[in-house]
């Protein structure tokens, strides 16, 4: 499903993908929050920005995709498929798969989805901020 190796992407292309991911992450979180009475858990942490946070490897795309794929096993909101497709564009072809254990308890499943969805939304905000501030520095 990888159409272009990520190192061929221009910073402007990466920014467009991250902007789209930011929008999709907000939609996912909005729908997930419809399930009232579910609280965020401290047990799950989504990796976000890479240490240098520079294009093309601005975010931990393989790990983030692995978490979203785990959510996809538990929930069939189609926005998740689209998020995974966009994350695919930001991944080197030889990226190793991250293993994530799927919660089995019903309520824990919901907490996992809410927690990762919220962290993913915050991560996309951070990534976009990092990209735009980097772009501004490059032009000055």
């Amino acid at each position: 499903s990888h159409t272009l190796p990520v190192h061929f992407l221009q910073p402007s292309d990466i920014q467009k993908i991250v902007e789209e991911l930011q929008s999709l992450s907000k939609m996912l979180l909005k729908d997930v929050k419809e399930d009232k009475g579910v609280l965020v858990s401290q047990n799950y942490t989504l990796p976000c920005l890479t240490p240098d946070a520079q294009p093309p490897n601005i975010i931990h795309s393989p790990a983030i995709r692995a978490y979203l794929k785990t959510i996809r096993q538990l929930d069939n909101k189609s926005v998740i498929d689209e998020i995974i497709e966009h994350l695919d564009k930001l991944i080197f072809q030889d990226a190793p798969e991250t293993n994530i254990s799927v919660p089995t308890d019903t309520h824990e499943c919901k907490r996992f989805i809410l927690t990762i969805s919220q962290q993913f939304s915050e991560c996309m905000d951070l990534a976009l901020k990092s990209l735009t501030s980097g772009a501004q520095q490059a032009t000055t």
Partner: antibody, heavy 124, light 110 residues
Framework: QSQLVESGGGSVQPGGSLRLSCAAS?????????ICWVRQAPGKGLEWIVC?????????YYAPWAKGRFTISKDNSKNTVYLQMNSLRAEDTATYFC???????????????WGQGTQVTVSS | AFQLTQSPSSLSASVGDRVTITCQAS??????LAWYQQKPGKPPKLLIY???KLASGVPSRFSGSGSGTDYTLTISSLQPEDFATYYC??????????WGFGTGTKVTVL
């Protein structure tokens, strides 16, 4: 009590059109489930037609054979999902059901809900 | 294209018999599988969801099992009211799958 009620069925000539409605009551069009149309020809099995997501985006998924002639839509203010059927053929004669399916594997059986169905007959 | 293959298409059995119906998906559906019972002129009635969870009000003689691509519905001791048609269905949605139904299994009196 949650229920789905189909209407709009009837007799139509080949090449004609019909719009079926699926009215939801006892629950609101908020998020986290799909509403689908399924049909059953006389003496035959269940056949999935199309689904629409009730949530931030009205994502739709069609059975490959249904694309082009069948269109699903929804009106949140009326809590209703529609199925527009065009260029109808004799083989479209069936009972048309609407059904609700959960978007979460962890959800309980109450998320599964079927209407009683509406009869569509295509004949000259 | 995604397919759900259900077998057998029909079977004859007696009251008290153990009945097994299988459903095979052409790709993994991660336990997003439901089983229904349908009687003539009625909508399908949910028996099992999430591959193995018994729907409320359904007798415990019905059970579901399986994962990945292979799933089974078992009726441990067939009762007179169980003579009907049974369908498996995936509700995984999205992706490359969709909401497929099996072809059905008609259970009749031997």
């Amino acid at each position: 009590q949650s229920q789905l009620v189909e209407s709009g069925g009837g007799s139509v000539q080949p090449g004609g059109s019909l719009r079926l409605s699926c009215a939801a009551s006892g629950f609101s069009f908020s998020a986290n489930y799909w509403i689908c149309w399924v049909r059953q020809a006389p003496g035959k099995g269940l056949e999935w037609i199309v689904c629409i997501y009730i949530g931030s985006r009205a994502d739709t998924y069609y059975a490959p054979w249904a694309k082009g002639r069948f269109t699903i839509s929804k009106d949140n203010s009326k809590n209703t999902v529609y199925l527009q059927m065009n260029s109808l053929r004799a083989e479209d004669t069936a009972t048309y059901f609407c059904a609700r399916f959960s978007s979460g594997i962890y959800d309980l059986d109450r998320f599964f809900l079927w209407g009683q169905g509406t009869q569509v007959t295509v004949s000259s | 294209a995604f397919q759900l293959t259900q077998s057998p298409s029909s079977l004859s059995a007696s009251v008290g018999d153990r009945v097994t119906i299988t459903c095979q998906a052409s790709q993994s559906i991660d336990s997003w599988l439901a089983w229904y019972q349908q009687k003539p002129g009625k909508p399908p009635k949910l028996l099992i969801y999430q591959a193995s969870k018994l729907a409320s009000g359904v007798p415990s003689r019905f059970s579901g099992s399986g994962s990945g691509t292979d799933y089974t519905l078992t009726i441990s001791s067939l009762q007179p009211e169980d003579f009907a048609t049974y369908y498996c269905q995936t509700y995984y949605g999205g992706g490359h799958i969709g909401w497929g139904f099996g072809t059905g299994t008609k259970v009749t009196v031997l």
